[in-house]
């Protein structure tokens, strides 16, 4: 009786269980009653990452430097090339097919999370008591200067974009 299901790493063809090709190899011909499955290694700059019955290997991804991409992990016969972005840039998608410049946090906002090759800068508004007076992809919100600890008094209140201005205390005669 011909099988209706096959073991792991096998496939059913012409009422027969044939061995799948291992990662890094493609199918040339199915097995027969008398012969094994015939597989062939993928060519240079090609890959297959699973046990398969593919007749063509996939091409390695190209990390195009003109799109701000660079290689994170070189491709092999069993794995695709993994791209990431040049410093200061991040991927526009999970597939990392192109890069965009990291966003800067405007004055009044600080960096909550610094960007990586795959994620953009996350900004947060500076809460009361903190400020940021620059546009930056790295700077967090800074605390207002404590005038008291310097034996000074607040002459000008701080905002989310400016520090407080301290001055000397008025001396009573």
């Amino acid at each position: 009786e011909p099988p209706t299901a096959c073991r792991e790493k096998q496939y059913l063809i012409n009422s027969q269980c044939c061995s799948l090709c291992q990662p890094g190899q493609k199918l040339v011909s199915d097995c027969t009653e008398f012969t094994e499955t015939e597989c062939l290694p993928c060519g240079e700059s090609e890959f297959l990452d699973t046990w398969n019955r593919e007749t063509h290997c996939h091409q390695h991804k190209y990390c195009d430097p003109n799109l701000g991409l660079r290689v994170q992990q070189k491709g092999t016969s069993e794995t695709d090339t993994i791209c990431t972005c040049e410093e200061g840039w991040h991927c526009t998608s999970e597939a990392c097919e192109s890069c965009v410049l990291h966003r800067s946090c405007s004055p009044g906002f600080g960096v909550k999370q610094i960007a990586t090759g795959v994620s953009d800068t996350i900004c947060e508004p500076c809460p009361v008591g903190f400020f940021s007076n620059v546009s930056s992809a790295f700077e967090k919100c800074h605390p207002w200067t404590s005038c008291e600890t310097k034996d000074l008094v607040v002459q000008q209140a701080g905002t989310n974009k400016t520090d407080v201005v301290c001055g000397p205390q008025d001396r009573l005669r």
Epitope: C42, E44, S45, E46, Q73, T76
Partner: antibody, heavy 119, light 113 residues
């Protein structure tokens, strides 16, 4: 027998150009990726550039990006390195090496050709 | 870029003795997809081009004597010559084959004591 033979080396003035060639024989050239690697006199090895078997993928070292161009002609079993705006620090023996689709390593190297950049 | 650091710079060993050299990479060379470490060793004899010795950290290239062995994983790798022969006098380079730019260590020069 696998053979890689580089040619085109010689004395070049700073700012000048040179084109290196690598003639391949003893294997199916179009099935292999190719690299250029250089070695300054008395120094270690420095990777320069890579081109995939089908010309689709090209990578360069930052030190040569924008000045050097790697190319190949599979019909002529030849690899090339066009070197422009040459500097004294480009003085080296230039090797071509092949990369197969199994090991993904440089498994055969040519004998090298010496490029000297000097006024 | 991945920085490859080899030690020692040179090594003098008696014939028949063991020679061991180290190679450290500034980041892991482990391919997450196939779990192979893409660390390659090349041998360069005086006046000759480099020759592939070992790939994937420990797999000897065809024709390489079994006195040569490679080991390690992640960022720390070792090349061992179990019984040094006169023809093993050379500079040995480790190489990052994991990512571009491909980078080489500075080399370890092996001499006869």
């Amino acid at each position: 027998e696998v053979q890689l033979v580089e040619s085109g080396g010689g004395l070049v003035k700073p700012g000048g150009s040179r084109r290196l060639s690598c003639a391949a024989s003893g294997f199916t050239f179009s099935d292999y990726g190719m690299h250029w690697v250089r070695q300054a006199p008395g120094k270690g090895l420095e990777w320069v550039a890579y081109i995939s078997s089908g010309n689709r993928i090209i990578y360069y070292a930052d030190t040569v990006k924008g000045r050097f161009t790697i190319s190949r002609d599979n019909a002529k079993n030849s690899l090339y390195l066009q070197m422009n705006s040459l500097r004294a620090e480009d003085t080296a023996v230039y090797y071509c090496a092949r990369q197969d689709g199994y090991r993904y390593a440089m498994d055969y190297w040519g004998q090298g050709t010496l490029v000297t950049v000097s006024s | 870029d991945i920085v490859m650091t080899q030690s020692p710079d040179s090594l003098a060993v008696s014939l028949g003795e063991r020679a061991t050299m180290s190679c450290k990479s500034s980041q892991s060379l482990l391919n997450s997809g196939n779990q192979k470490n893409y660390l390659t060793w090349h041998q360069q004899k005086p006046g000759q081009p480099p020759k592939l010795l070992i790939y994937w950290t420990s797999t000897r290239e065809s024709g390489v004597p079994d006195r040569f062995s490679g080991s390690g994983s992640g960022t720390d790798f070792t090349l061992t010559i179990s019984s040094l022969q006169a023809e093993d006098v050379a500079v040995y380079y480790c190489q990052n084959d994991y990512t571009y730019p491909l980078t080489f260590g500075g080399g370890t020069k092996v001499e006869i004591k």
